[in-house]
């Protein structure tokens, strides 16, 4: 079909449509008309756009041109940043994609000039007069959903007539935007007008299912039902789906409805919208959002364990003070010449059966958030060091006033009994930031790295993840905790909660993927209180950044509900944020402020052997090491592992300003 | 090269018609638009029609309106101008005229490729 | 119709001198201009098009600039092959284009 008929044409995709308009406009009235249909000049900022304008425009003839929404003010030449100074109609600059027909060459820019594409060829970009009626202009226009081209059916008198809210016709949609209306005309007479729009369960699709015109009934293939046919009264026929799916759009095929993953922990189909999320033994569903899941926690329990509690994602775990030891019932503690132990109360172990251990436990491991509590009317006792296990540097509190930690002995337990061995990670804080986040990106199965099952004592501080604190991106920045890590922290406890699973590989069900499981909330500072820092060990330092996502804290946080600790003196060296790379970068981690990745223990591309960190035990030589992505160069090198989860509106490659930098528009521009 | 080769002069009754060729070489005719302009004696230039031999579109000027046609041979690369019923003003001569699609990266609509022109007399 | 008005429509310099040419526009025509040079029984030659750009070939003593309403077209010093008409054309409302009356260069 030539483009240039007298007719329109577009090109639509899931979330927005390109339209082809043949008429001779200056640059202003081309806006004008795409905004009066409700969208605006095309503004094809990535490869894939531009695709899929070429595809639109086609083999145009040479000499046609057609505005697209690129206009720069006079004077405002900026040769060296890919759009030379031009803004977009949309008010901003940033782009992933040019096409410029030549080299910026120097100039003064004297005049405002607009941006037109040419029809032929390449499809190239070239700058000219605003007031210069060219041949066409290209409109985009955005929308919340669109609807697959309907199926043609055996009945039909012809193909389907599509009708956009944006008054293109045509019959050759494959996607059409919400509020488009098709019109199928049947062979028997009748036709039927259906419309796109918004389904309860959420999402659009057809206002009706099909089949749409009488035809032989549900022979010869099933009525083109994937399921079942179902011939009506009046010859209609009709599709229904088996007990655990649901009718598509297409009002054909069926679909599961928890195949999207739509529930953070389990689906169950069935239910009002198709389907119901279900929570492991251990969490609850989030009040704010059904589909997601907090963990409860069992320590704010009164008498849930006789002295010391530590609550973790799915599960807790009773502790006694030196001197004492855990009871059978995991609950109780007794005086004992033995030093202390631990009884494990994950809540998923005693439920499971073998075929169900890999489903359901230790993702929460990953993004451990737990915290200490201490049952009321425990002293804290003088710690206990293992030879092997000397505390290189520990936090400082005034006087005589200081509260000791007790770092007891492992004891090891058989693995059935006691599937975890506790493990901290070296940041204590002794006030959690609050967290008002009520929405952490989940990701599919797929993206989740596994986690390495070992048994093992605890590990020497050479061999430790570094913790990097969570920021939480719908905190207004003056709020958010700072953020710091070290390279080398400091030596832990013996006694901690595990990052490592000792029982149950991780292989998570299509219907689960929690990456970033909520974490219950104590303390109302926003301030992450570190160990001090020995002169030697340079920090690592994380980009903050306004779309980055929520890193799951993987400390435990020690909380008395006996005596608030008091906070560590100023002698330890402040947190430090950062926006853009640190000057030395030895042991930093650079990351694009919009793809910084959680700080989770993941599987990451092998890279220089020194400064890694790792928890495991250097006794399991066969075992995986997580490594931290070290930014040694300008460029990030963390793209080939970021989560499907990372924000659309990351910065491009070619580094224009970011979307929200948006510039305010007014008719005297145009 | 690109070279716009007009036919030669013309004189005619007034009444009469007259068509005038255009022959372009050098380049590809479907992919650029040919302009004819008037020039009479002392006059300043005058803007008549266009041709997008592409697509055979066409746009006249109004004043010409009527009497007019402009049409191409694509394969013979060859514009034609014909103007019917001819008085006395249509002395002059007539520019067929290339109009440039881009230079250097700019759009723009200027005749970057003249004809050497034809002059027309209209006497009785 | 959108009219060019230009001054002066004649102009008499001398070799070496500095010339410019104004070109007025009923109304707003953006940069849509372009200027031609045209020499007796010749057909005119492209100089400068959108406003201010240097057509391929033409010597750099040949300068365009203004947007809106007013242009000028600058010839640096003069060479004797420069004595000619000059014409500014818009083309904003384009394919309507129209043509300034002329401005002849002669020699002093």
């Known amino acids: 079909q030539d483009p240039w008929a007298a007719e329109p044409r577009s090109a639509c995709g899931p979330s927005s449509c390109y339209a082809l308009f043949p008429r001779r406009r200056t640059f202003l009235e081309a806006w004008r008309a795409c905004r009066e249909l409700g969208g605006d000049l095309a503004t094809p900022r990535t490869p894939e756009e531009a695709q899929r304008v070429d595809n639109l425009v086609g083999a145009g003839p040479a000499s046609r041109l057609l505005w697209i929404g690129l206009q720069r003010q006079a004077r405002q030449c900026q040769l060296q940043r890919p759009l030379r100074g031009f803004t977009w109609t949309t008010g901003d600059q940033d782009t992933a994609f040019t096409n410029w027909a030549q080299p910026a060459t120097g100039g003064p820019c004297p005049a405002q000039r607009c941006v037109a594409l040419e029809a032929s060829g390449e499809h190239r970009w070239l700058e000219g007069s605003c007031t210069l009626a060219v041949d066409g202009y290209l409109c985009q226009f955005g929308f919340e959903g669109a609807c697959p081209a309907l199926q043609d059916e055996a009945g039909q008198a012809g193909p389907a007539v599509y009708t956009t809210p944006f008054h293109l016709v045509s019959t050759e949609f494959e996607w059409l935007p919400f509020g488009s209306v098709a019109a199928v005309q049947c062979q028997a007479g009748r036709g039927a007008s259906l419309l796109c729009v918004k389904q309860p369960e959420g999402g659009v699709g057809w206002s009706r299912a099909g089949p749409l015109c009488l035809g032989a009934g549900c022979s010869p293939d099933n009525g083109g039902c994937e399921h079942e046919c179902v011939e009506e009264v009046d010859g209609h026929v009709s599709c229904r789906c088996t007990e655990g799916f649901r009718l598509a759009a297409d009002g054909r095929s069926c679909e599961d409805p928890c195949a999207q993953a739509p529930c953070e922990q389990q689906c169950e189909p069935g239910g009002p919208q198709g389907y119901s999320c279900h929570c492991r033994l251990g969490f609850r569903p989030a009040e704010d959002d059904p589909h997601r899941c907090v963990d409860t926690d069992e320590c704010q329990i009164a008498g849930v364990c006789q002295q010391m509690c530590v609550n973790y994602v799915g599960g807790f775990e009773c502790y006694c003070s030196e001197g004492h030891e855990l009871e059978a019932d995991g609950i109780s503690c007794s005086p004992a010449g033995a030093m202390g132990a631990r009884a494990s109360q994950d809540l998923g172990d005693e439920l499971l059966d073998d075929g169900e251990d890999e489903e359901d436990e230790d993702e929460a491991w990953e993004a451990f958030g737990g915290g200490w509590t201490e049952m009321p009317g425990i002293l804290w006792m003088e710690p206990t060091q293992p030879p092997d296990f000397a505390l290189a540097y520990r936090p400082s509190f005034p006087e005589d006033r200081e509260p000791q930690i007790p770092y007891p002995e492992p004891t090891w337990p058989p693995p059935l009994s006691a599937p975890r061995v506790p493990y901290h990670s070296s940041v204590l804080s002794v006030t959690r930031p609050v967290v008002v986040s009520a929405t952490r990106p989940t990701l599919p199965s797929a993206h989740q790295p596994p986690v390495i099952p070992a048994t093992h004592p605890a590990l020497s501080r050479d061999h430790q993840i570094p913790v990097i604190a969570a920021n939480y991106p719908d905190l207004p920045s003056a709020y958010q905790p700072g953020i710091l890590s070290v390279s080398h922290p400091a030596q832990p406890p013996a006694h901690q909660p595990p990052m490592i699973s000792t029982r149950y590989p991780e292989l998570f069900p299509a219907h689960q993927s929690p990456m970033f499981p909520d974490t219950q909330v104590a303390g109302t500072q926003t301030t992450t209180h570190l160990p001090a820092i020995p002169p030697n060990r340079a920090p690592l330092v994380t980009t903050l950044g306004a779309h980055q996502p929520p890193q799951a804290p993987d400390a435990p946080v020690l909380r008395t509900q006996a005596t608030q600790l008091p906070i560590i003196p100023t002698a330890q060296p402040s947190l430090t944020t950062s926006s853009r790379s640190p000057v030395s970068p030895a042991h930093q981690v650079s990351v694009p402020a919009a793809t910084q990745p959680p700080a989770l223990p993941t599987l990451l591309p092998s890279q220089s052997p020194t400064n890694q960190t790792s928890p495991i035990s250097p006794t399991h030589p066969h075992s995986k090491v997580p490594q931290i992505p070290r930014e040694d160069g300008p460029s990030p090198k963390l793209a080939l592992w970021l989560p499907s989860a990372a924000p659309t509106a990351a910065p491009t490659a070619l580094g224009e300003a970011s979307l929200a930098e948006h510039i305010q528009r007014d008719d005297r521009w145009l | 090269q690109v070279q716009l080769v007009q036919s030669g002069p013309e004189v005619k009754k007034p009444g009469a018609s007259v068509k005038l060729s255009c022959k372009a070489s050098?380049?590809?005719?479907?992919?650029?638009?040919i302009h004819w302009v008037k020039q009479a004696p002392g006059q300043r230039l005058e803007w008549m029609g266009y041709?997008?031999?592409?697509?055979?579109?066409?746009t006249y000027n109004q004043k010409f309106k009527g009497r007019v046609t402009i049409t191409v041979d694509t394969s013979a690369s060859t514009a034609y101008m014909e103007l019917n019923s001819l008085r006395s003003e249509d002395t002059a001569v007539y520019y067929c005229a290339r109009r440039g699609n881009s230079y250097d990266g700019y759009f723009d609509y200027s005749m970057d490729y003249w004809g050497q022109g034809t002059l027309v007399t209209v006497s009785s | 119709d959108i009219q060019l008005t230009q001054s002066p429509s004649f102009l008499s310099a001398s070799v070496g001198d500095r010339v410019t040419i104004t070109c007025r526009a009923s109304q707003n025509v953006g940069t849509a201009v372009a200027w031609y040079q045209q020499k007796p029984g010749k057909a005119p030659k492209l100089l400068i098009y959108?406003?201010?750009n240097r057509y391929t070939g033409v010597p750099s003593r040949f300068s365009g600039s203004g947007s809106g309403t007013e242009f000028t077209l600058t010839i640096s010093s003069l060479q004797p092959e420069d004595f000619a008409t000059y014409y500014c054309q818009q083309y904003t409302n384009y394919p309507m284009y129209t043509f300034g009356q002329g401005t002849k260069l002669e020699i002093k």
């Open positions: 959108s406003a201010s």
């Open positions: 041709i997008n031999p592409y697509d055979d579109d066409t």
């Open positions: 050098g380049y590809t005719f479907t992919d650029y638009v």
